[in-house]
């Protein structure tokens, strides 16, 4: 079953900065990533970049830099403006589209014990409905 | 997610028409387009119409004249009337939500079930 990590990592140098890491395990190729934060995509989460293979990137604030790490993977750099955006204390999304067969999509976050530059665990939280596009034609 | 439902697919002669409607549940505006692919058995799948945010359709250009993309935002329904059918047209139909890159790419984020067009000769 294919299945979505998310890493969220503080930068050690500028703990205004965040990374977020996303990668997709399964077979197939990858249409489109979704990252949003706050929630799941479409259920409460806002938008912070989508990204394709072949056609680029777009990102919103407070995002700052959205990029393909791999065929299966990509990173999002965030710019925290202090109390008004608690990345710390956020969830974020990654959702990976593969049209037509399926997208899948998982959350993770920041660990409130982690040090400054110390990645968290790619410990993927599914989302209930991540596999409802699964079509078999 | 948002939730698409596509209707109205189904068997027609060459020359034909057929109109396929497309009902959208949990509906956000956070994407800039909506449309419609297709795709054939042991093909690339297709962008076949889409409307932008700003309500400007565009079509693939082997549609163009024949196909008709609309929306009914009262009834968050996305319609294609497909007239003057070909055998080429047969595909699955799948209505579809998602983000614009350039003028004439919808990237699908969310898309539905499909509907099965088939056209004879």
């Known amino acids: 079953t294919p299945e979505v990590w998310v890493q969220v990592q503080m930068e050690a140098t500028e703990l205004s900065s965040f990374t977020v890491h996303c990668g997709f395990l399964g077979p197939g190729s990858i249409s489109l990533v979704t990252v949003s934060w706050g929630g799941p995509d479409g259920a409460g989460g806002t938008k912070l970049a989508v990204l394709h293979p072949e056609l680029g990137t777009r990102q919103w604030a407070p995002a700052r830099q959205a990029r393909w790490e791999t065929q299966s993977s990509i990173s999002l750099a965030l710019e925290d403006s202090g109390a008004s955006s608690p990345f710390a204390n956020t969830t974020f999304c990654c959702k990976f589209a593969s049209f037509p067969e399926g997208s899948w999509e998982s959350c993770g976050s920041l660990p409130p014990s982690s040090d400054p530059g110390l990645s968290a665990p790619p410990t993927p939280v599914p989302i209930l409905r991540a596999d409802h596009h699964h079509h078999h034609h | 997610d948002v939730q698409l439902v596509e209707s109205g697919g189904g068997s027609v002669q060459a020359g034909g028409s057929l109109r396929l409607s497309c009902v959208a549940s949990?509906?956000?505006?956070?994407?800039?387009?909506m449309g419609w692919f297709r795709q054939a058995p042991g093909k690339e799948h297709e962008g076949v119409a889409h409307?932008?945010?700003?309500?400007?359709?565009r079509y693939v250009d082997s549609v163009k004249g024949r196909f008709t993309i609309s929306q009914d935002h009262a009834k968050n329904t996305l319609y294609l009337q497909m007239n003057s059918l070909k055998p080429e047209d047969s595909a699955t139909y799948y209505c579809?939500?998602?983000?614009?890159?350039?003028?004439?790419?919808?990237?699908?984020?969310?898309w539905g079930q499909g509907t099965q067009v088939t056209v004879s000769s």
């Open positions: 949990r509906y956000t505006s956070r994407t800039d387009c």
């Open positions: 579809v939500v998602g983000f614009k890159f350039d003028d004439d790419y919808c990237a699908p984020n969310d």
């Open positions: 409307i932008d945010s700003d309500g400007i359709p």
